[in-house]
């Protein structure tokens, strides 16, 4: 039961993490002009990873995107392709991991097949989440350098008498949404890695009682094989799964003919 | 069809307060802006300040302390406030809308306030 | 405040003549997100309230006819009349719109010679 939840869990998680993700990437304020030194600008600057944008107190926001590839900071290229894996990787994770889940049944699949693909969507959903978290931290990095930057030549004059306000950027909302969504991936794929540890033997000491005469018992050694005592061993010639300690008789889940010969 | 209407009143004697309210139609204020500019007889135009569809304004910092601009979204109207009145404060007062580069598209024709005892 | 300075204060013109008349800005108004600059140009006729002319330094309002040129960028602006016409006598005003307060020049009058 508590394998179940640790998957459910981890499954919802992730899927609000990559929603946020995908959010983040398509939000436009991931730098917000800095208003420290112009609080009382008429025109507010933010930009986003596809286009930039103009907001003017009038209410008239003006957007235009960034219609070139080759004339882009390498740092922005590396950004948008770090957020676009996090959201592919995430995205096949989470498709993974619908056919992983304990509570939905799909044909004749076995339990040690949904363990390895939790811990498949497991993995995808932690590496999601590190590549958002990156991306973001990238960009972030890359503001801090320019803030410093532009701080430092902020008034060029024109004989002391002309000023011209170099526009400063800060941190935008996407980057906080970006990083909170990247640590729900993260969070939500070790949750996936943890349930897929505990799916197996849940599993099989859940078949063993069912299966079972009441007087027949089940040990289980560290490595997770099982070891049958009792009435001779092996006795109705089950066989043995390493990943799982499951028998042909589970492979179905729900009862068929071979249940009650 | 937008369109501004000022209306004042007229004569106040200094010291006093002045109020204005600007009636606009064909546009709705939740949406827009209203500027206010002031131009004494004879000389060039001041900006005063301005609200905008959210509710926030901005005022001219040598006015900042005892201007007051609000607004009725329901009834369309904008209200102008100026306190302690000189006579340096005779103008004629309009209000405008702002849009595009929050450059004034649409102008009332204005209302004439002369402060004099 | 950006003080805003337009010369010349008057000028004295025949229809048909070319005028310019300039504005300075004490901060440059060119926004660097959309590459614009925030400065307005009006007309104010005798006894009537301004009108717009040209907003973003160069563009054309809508109604606005094609002899009237906005141009200029940063600090420095023109408003160009390619041929004056006797409604085009009156005073000229440009307008700071990038940051507050949204700041006038004191005018510039264009009178018939």
């Known amino acids: 039961m508590a394998v179940t939840a640790c998957q459910g869990l981890g499954f919802v998680v992730s899927l609000i993490g990559i929603a946020g993700i995908i959010a983040a990437t398509c939000m436009d304020q991931w730098s917000t002009q800095d208003l420290y030194n112009n609080p009382v600008t008429a025109v507010f600057n933010y930009q986003g990873l596809w286009r930039s944008c103009v907001r003017e107190s009038s209410g008239f926001t003006e957007c235009r995107g960034y219609f070139t590839l080759l004339g882009l900071p390498a740092m922005l290229q590396a950004v948008r392709a770090l957020m676009i894996v996090g959201i592919v990787l995430g995205a096949i994770g989470l498709l993974v991991s619908i056919f992983a889940l304990k509570c939905i049944r799909i044909g004749s699949m076995e339990d040690s097949a949904k363990a390895n693909m939790t811990l498949t969507s497991g993995i995808m959903f932690i590496v999601s989440g590190l590549c958002a978290i990156a991306g973001v931290s990238v960009f972030a990095n890359m503001l801090v350098t320019n803030f410093w930057m532009s701080t430092a030549n902020m008034y060029t004059g024109m004989g002391g008498m002309v000023q011209t306000v170099q526009t400063r950027y800060t941190f935008g909302a996407a980057l906080f949404v970006g990083w909170v969504a990247g640590g729900l991936t993260l969070i939500g794929g070790v949750m996936m890695c943890i349930a897929c540890r505990g799916l197996a033997p849940e599993e099989t000491n859940y078949k063993a009682v069912s299966y079972h005469a009441s007087g027949h018992s089940v040990a289980y050694k560290p490595g997770g094989f099982k070891a049958s005592t009792g009435f001779g061993s092996n006795t109705k010639n089950k066989k043995i799964y390493d990943g799982g300690a499951r028998t042909e008789d589970e492979v179905q889940s729900y009862p068929s003919k071979h249940d009650y010969v | 069809q937008v369109q501004l209407k000022e209306s004042g009143p007229g004569l106040v004697a200094p010291s006093q307060s002045l109020s204005i309210t600007c009636i606009v139609s064909g546009f709705s204020l939740t949406t827009y802006g209203i500027s206010w500019v002031r131009q004494p007889p004879g000389k060039g135009l001041e900006w005063l300040g301005v609200?905008?569809?959210?509710?926030?304004?901005h005022y001219h910092s040598a006015l900042i302390s005892r201007l007051s601009i609000s607004k009725d979204n329901s009834k369309s109207q904008v209200f102008l406030k100026l306190n302690s009145l000189q006579t340096d404060d005779t103008a004629t007062y309009y209000c405008a809308k702002p849009y595009y580069s929050n450059a004034m598209d649409y102008w009332g024709q204005g209302t004439s306030v002369t402060v004099s005892s | 405040d950006i003080v805003m300075t337009q010369s010349p204060s008057s000028l004295t013109v025949t229809v048909g003549e070319k005028v310019t008349m300039s504005c300075k800005s004490s901060?440059?108004?060119?926004?660097?997100?959309?590459?614009?600059?925030?400065l307005t140009w009006y007309r104010q006729k005798p006894g009537q309230p301004p009108e717009l002319l040209i907003y973003?330094?160069?563009t054309r309002e809508s109604g606005v006819p094609d002899r009237f040129t906005g141009s200029g960028s940063g600090t420095d602006f023109t408003l160009t009349i390619s041929s004056v016409q006797a409604e085009d006598l009156a005073v000229y005003y440009c307008q700071n719109v990038y940051s507050y307060p949204l700041t006038f020049g004191a005018g510039t009058k264009l009178e018939l010679k």
């Open positions: 609200i905008w569809g959210d509710g926030s304004t």
């Open positions: 901060q440059s108004l060119l926004n660097s997100g959309n590459q614009k600059n925030y």
């Open positions: 973003w330094a160069s």
